[in-house]
Interface confidence: low
């Protein structure tokens, strides 16, 4: 089951996924001057069985120099508003992504590909938030946020997180950023 | 709102070339991928191919793959259909379909009917 | 790249509840949760009812649902209305980024 919304916009921090549930879509985008092989996968998809998850498809960028188009990414964030756009970057936690069964580790980079990544995620999904640089984390609440289906709809749990610049009064001085906290951990996917 | 708008029907004879056309309206255009279906008089859809009209990225179902050719003009939001030698057998209704969330064809156009007849 | 396999007929009266079968194979259905099924009513172009196998768009009735299991995917329709009365292709995204279609089934809705 798909995740109907985009995990919550936190101001000034962004957001990643440790590990990718089985039947996430990463959408295969290539950086400007860059498209699609010809044939290649439109998108690559976490599959696998009880013992092994790994990536179906793989992405494949070509330049596109021999055209007078350049490849747009599908879909525009900003025009199809289907999932939220993350941004390339090293993981914020040290979770072991090999040991969690039924999910995919970050699918590594290809040639040529778009700067940022927009993936569809699906019920049971989890990402953490981080302040971004310059910014630091003023609540000591869950940096993480979970989709979940209630009652038929799938909605994204609120992160406890409040980013505010580095010149401001900070409750927890030494705080840089947010930590997962136990309590935070996500209820049964299927609650009613 | 969101809509395809599809050229009118086509009455042709065997061996003649014939170009039809999908216009998007409502909606990015460049932004979403474009399919071809067939459906033949009587009988099932069938998918023919899909293209990215962005930048003319372009797909064909191995059944159609030289059979047809799928093109775009990003400038005017139009997807093409065209055949260089029609044959009696694509008599059939040609729809054109935006491919929006979730690898779902969400929007439909009205469909062309294309009829070949000596 | 074969069509997925649906019965090409079912009926029933109103007030009852079918179910629509489509078999693929492993390269498509049973690959991703990337199947839709569409309505077409007589003389009318295709309209999306359910997509991810049972999700539906805004304006779709709730009667229609989906399930997956394998490599066949089903329709079921409740409450059978006579305005339900169409044919019904499955379609499924495949391993080779392409899209196949069911051959489709024809709904009756006995009077």
């Known amino acids: 089951e798909l995740c109907d919304d985009d995990p919550p916009e936190i101001p000034h921090a962004t957001f990643k996924a440790m590990a990718y549930k089985e039947g996430t879509m990463l959408n295969c985008e290539c950086k400007r001057g860059f498209r699609r092989i010809k044939s290649g996968s439109l998108y690559m998809l976490c599959t696998g069985n009880s013992s092994h998850s790994s990536w179906d498809n793989q992405c494949q960028c070509t330049s596109s120099a021999t055209r007078n188009t350049t490849k747009q990414v599908t879909p525009q964030p900003e025009e199809q508003k289907e999932r939220k756009t993350t941004e390339m970057q090293s993981p914020m936690q040290p979770v072991d992504q090999a040991s969690l069964p039924g999910h995919c580790r970050e699918p590594p980079p290809w040639e040529n590909e778009a700067t940022e990544r927009i993936y569809h995620f699906v019920v049971g999904q989890m990402v953490y938030y981080q302040c971004v640089q310059g910014y630091r984390a003023l609540h000591r609440g869950p940096a993480e946020s979970v989709c979940k289906m209630t009652h038929g709809k799938t909605r994204w749990t609120q992160p406890q997180l409040i980013c505010t610049g580095e010149m401001e009064t900070s409750q927890f001085p030494g705080e840089e950023k947010p930590q997962a906290s136990p309590e935070g951990r996500p209820e049964s996917e299927t609650s009613c | 709102q969101v809509q395809l708008v599809q050229s009118g029907a086509e009455v042709k004879k065997p061996g003649e070339s014939l170009k039809i056309s999908c216009k998007g309206s409502?909606?990015?255009?460049?932004?979403?991928?474009i399919g071809w279906v067939r459906q033949m008089p009587g009988k099932g859809l069938e998918w023919m191919g899909i293209i990215y009209p962005g930048d003319s990225d372009t797909r064909y179902s191995p059944s159609f793959q030289g059979q047809v050719t799928i093109s775009a003009d990003k400038s005017i939001s139009t997807a093409y259909l065209q055949w260089s030698s029609l044959k009696a057998s694509d008599t059939a209704m040609y729809y054109c379909?935006?491919?929006?969330?979730?690898?779902?064809?969400?929007?439909w156009g009205r469909g062309t009917m294309v009829t070949v007849s000596s | 790249q074969s069509a997925l396999t649906q019965p090409a007929s079912v009926s029933a009266s109103p007030g009852q509840s079918i179910t629509i079968s489509c078999t693929g194979t492993?390269?498509?259905?049973?690959?991703?949760?990337?199947v839709s099924w569409y309505q077409q009513l007589s003389g009318k172009p295709p309209k999306l009812i359910l997509y991810?196998?049972?999700k539906r768009p805004s304006g779709i009735s709730d009667r229609f649902s989906g399930s997956k299991s394998g490599n066949t995917a089903s329709l079921t329709i409740s409450g059978l209305q006579a305005d339900d009365e169409a044919d019904y292709y499955c379609s499924s995204y495949t391993r080779s980024s392409t899209w196949v279609f069911g051959g489709g089934t024809q709904l009756t809705v006995l009077g």
């Open positions: 991810d196998v049972s």
């Open positions: 409502g909606y990015s255009s460049t932004s979403y991928w």
């Open positions: 492993s390269s498509d259905v049973g690959a991703y949760i990337y």
């Open positions: 379909a935006r491919l929006g969330s979730y690898a779902a064809f969400d929007i």
